[in-house]
């Protein structure tokens, strides 16, 4: 689609005569008829196949035609066409005399013709005007012409339609040849594809406008090159989306099991030493003068029963004081004024004279101690049971009752529920306070990974561009069924754009 433009510049008819030689009365009131048609080697009458146009009266006898795009007179004359410009044409320009105001062909006498010129040739589309001058014996016409494309049409023959746009359907202007020229930040055949932020990860990132980088599910960061850990993860990181790789000191499926309770919680009080002993488990070694699971209890000086021979202990600010029974003296009532004759040995202890009868010593039966065998042996005073075990006096010996998950004479060994490898099919075993837990490899499930399940290889949405994902049950892998226009194992490449 385009326009043939004809610019009339000057018409000379000095004698003011018609083609017949007869003069016009009072002068030749001149108007023009233009006929544009397909190329003919010899221009003949017939339909104006490319269009025709008439002018109003432009002057009398000889005159210059001024440029005018307003009013009745339009110069240059416009002959629009809505087909591909063929590059060749025939042009007929007739100058007529108008005796009256009616310029219709049927209203004019045949001899009102002043002159007629016909040209033919090649004409390329372009902005430049071709200047021509045609002379007959009595008249001369100077004019120029050109062919230009209509708005939104481009190319050598005005056949390429291109309308600039900046909307959802494209972001471009049109080049002179009709090709699209994308606006900055846009690419693709119709400039619909934004150019993402430089460095934006090709697979993990995308954009809906230029210089943007939006992440696909499971990825984060400026360039979408960092994964997001699993929703339930507490103290872990990832190397691929939805993983939960535990930070140091944490364990369990979601890294919520505290393996370093001592550091994270500092449970031991009063300067005690803390030792980790498994998940959420610890042992406090108390400083002298403190007791309790967390060494939170301050020992009374009298708690160690320092007074011997039945002496009673009284706490004092600066220590303690022993009140001795009759026959004993000393800081701890350790000295006796008694002899074996006073039967000082209790609980079946036997008395032995010393220092020629000035003192004595008691030999105690099992389970009793003290200068006078007055104290029952408590074999639990040294807190021998580790890991929260309970100490029990059993006659001449003691026994530790261990908490679940521990064993040994002193509960010093952690019982691993995982020792017997209970997880089938390569499952990973985790010791928990409540028992063991198996983390199963892909394709297995159940408390002990004993059930074979089909892997949903499509669970991670591996297919791009709205492809349909299928799980190949024989190989437990995914297969992407690409929509029209996309290829690749994940349908990630548009047809015609091979992987770079």
């Amino acid at each position: 689609s385009g326009v043939f433009q004809l610019q009339l510049q000057e018409f000379v008819n000095e004698r003011g005569v018609l083609a017949s030689g007869r003069p016009c009365e009072p002068g030749c009131r001149t108007f023009f008829r233009v006929c544009l048609k397909h190329f003919q080697a010899v221009v003949s009458p017939g339909p104006c196949t490319f269009g025709s146009v008439s002018t109003p009266v432009l002057g009398t006898n000889s005159f210059a035609v001024r440029d005018d795009s307003s009013g009745g007179g339009r110069n240059p004359l416009q002959l629009p066409f809505n087909f591909t410009w063929p590059g060749t044409f025939s042009l007929i320009i007739e100058a007529w005399h108008a005796p009256g105001d009616d310029l219709r062909p049927e209203a004019l006498p045949p001899d009102a013709l002043i002159s007629k010129i016909a040209i033919q040739g090649s004409l390329a589309v372009g902005q430049n005007w071709l200047l021509d001058e045609q002379t007959s014996t009595l008249t001369r016409l100077r004019y120029s012409y050109r062919v230009i494309c209509s708005d939104n049409y481009y190319g050598d023959n005005c056949s390429r339609l291109c309308k600039k746009r900046n909307d959802h359907f494209g972001h471009y202007v049109c080049q002179p040849d009709g090709n699209l020229s994308c606006l900055p930040g846009w690419t693709g055949e119709y400039c619909q594809q934004p150019i993402c932020l430089s460095g934006c990860h090709e697979q993990n990132g995308y954009c809906s406008k230029p210089a943007e980088c939006l992440c696909r599910p499971g990825w984060q960061g400026r360039l979408c090159n960092e994964c997001i850990p699993h929703n339930g993860c507490r103290h872990g990181t990832c190397s691929t989306p939805w993983q939960c790789t535990c930070d140091e000191g944490w364990g369990g499926l979601f890294c919520d099991q505290d393996l370093n309770y001592c550091t994270h919680h500092s449970p031991c009080k009063n300067g005690a030493t803390c030792s980790n002993s498994g998940q959420r488990s610890y042992t406090c070694t108390c400083r002298p003068g403190y007791t309790g699971v967390d060494c939170e209890l301050e020992l009374s000086e009298c708690d160690s029963n320092p007074c011997r021979n039945g002496g009673s202990c009284k706490d004092q600010e600066d220590g303690y004081h022993c009140l001795c029974p009759p026959g004993y003296y000393g800081l701890h009532c350790e000295h006796s004024t008694l002899s074996c004759a006073d039967s000082p040995c209790f609980n079946g202890g036997s008395c032995r004279e010393r220092n020629q009868g000035a003192s004595y010593a008691c030999e105690c039966p099992p389970n009793f101690t003290g200068s006078n065998c007055e104290k029952k042996v408590d074999r639990c005073t040294s807190n021998p049971c580790a890991n929260g075990g309970q100490c029990l006096n059993r006659g001449p010996s003691r026994m530790c009752r261990c908490r679940p998950g521990f064993t040994g004479t002193y509960c010093e060994r952690h019982v691993s529920d995982c020792a017997r490898n209970p997880c089938a099919h390569g499952g990973t075993c985790h010791d928990l306070e409540s028992g063991l837990m198996c983390t199963c490899p892909a394709g297995f499930s159940g408390r002990r990974c004993e059930v074979r399940t089909s892997i949903d290889a499509c669970a991670s949405s591996p297919c791009f561009n709205r492809a349909t994902c299928y799980t190949d049950l024989s190989t437990d892998t995914f297969v992407c069924n690409c929509p029209y226009g996309f290829v690749g194992s994940r349908c990630e490449f548009p047809v015609g754009l091979p992987p770079s």
């Epitope: 809906s208 599910p217 499971g218 984060q220 960061g221 960092e226 929703n231 339930g232 872990g236 930070d247």
Partner: antibody, heavy 118, light 107 residues
Framework: EVQLVESGGGLVQPGGSLRLSCAAS????????MSWVRQAPGKGLEWVAS????????TIGDSVKGRFTISRDNAKNSLYLQMNSLRAEDTAVYYC???????????WGQGTLVTVSS | DIQMTQSPSSLSASVGDRVTITCRAS??????LAWYQQKPGKAPKLLIY???NLADGVPSRFSGSGSGTDFTLTISSLQPEDFATYYC?????????FGQGTKLEIK
Amino acid sequence: EVQLVESGGGLVQPGGSLRLSCAASGFTFGNFPMSWVRQAPGKGLEWVASISSSDSWATIGDSVKGRFTISRDNAKNSLYLQMNSLRAEDTAVYYCSRGYYNSPFAYWGQGTLVTVSS
Amino acid sequence: DIQMTQSPSSLSASVGDRVTITCRASEDIYSNLAWYQQKPGKAPKLLIYDTNNLADGVPSRFSGSGSGTDFTLTISSLQPEDFATYYCQQYNNYPPTFGQGTKLEIK
């Protein structure tokens, strides 16, 4: 136990500013992306902004872009939302949440009410 | 932006009933859909993610299904504590968008 506690809400005049804070505990804060989600009185939920974990890359919703900024301080286990040029339509309960714009919002705070009114 | 449409907007049911809530996306979101439960004056709580995965500590009476554009939340046997408002949310396309909510009331 994961805990998110928002603070800083209150009554503010149109055109005013407010800064919301969120204190996180019970998880390694620096490992996870965080978001703000809001809920106008009697209405549904609307995502406001997200921030990535290590490079603190902020993504802001169109309705608040140019007015709100999201930031974090991993050393203080804290998330922030700076709200400027507040409008009546910003009136809502603002929730701090662990999650990103392309993931589920796994944990939520109790919310803090922001009222924009003259 | 992707529109998420929940139906019904509200429903009444009794303890022990089986209840189904649906959520429709205006375009394909694959399986990137979550469900939340919200009680009056409280924050939302994640129930289900990736269409059918139960979040930590959520009772097994809750289940999710669907793919593409149509999704369902099912409560197999309603308990008194399940009466609340439920929201679906897509996180496949930016920005993330929520459904308008479904209020589950006691009949």
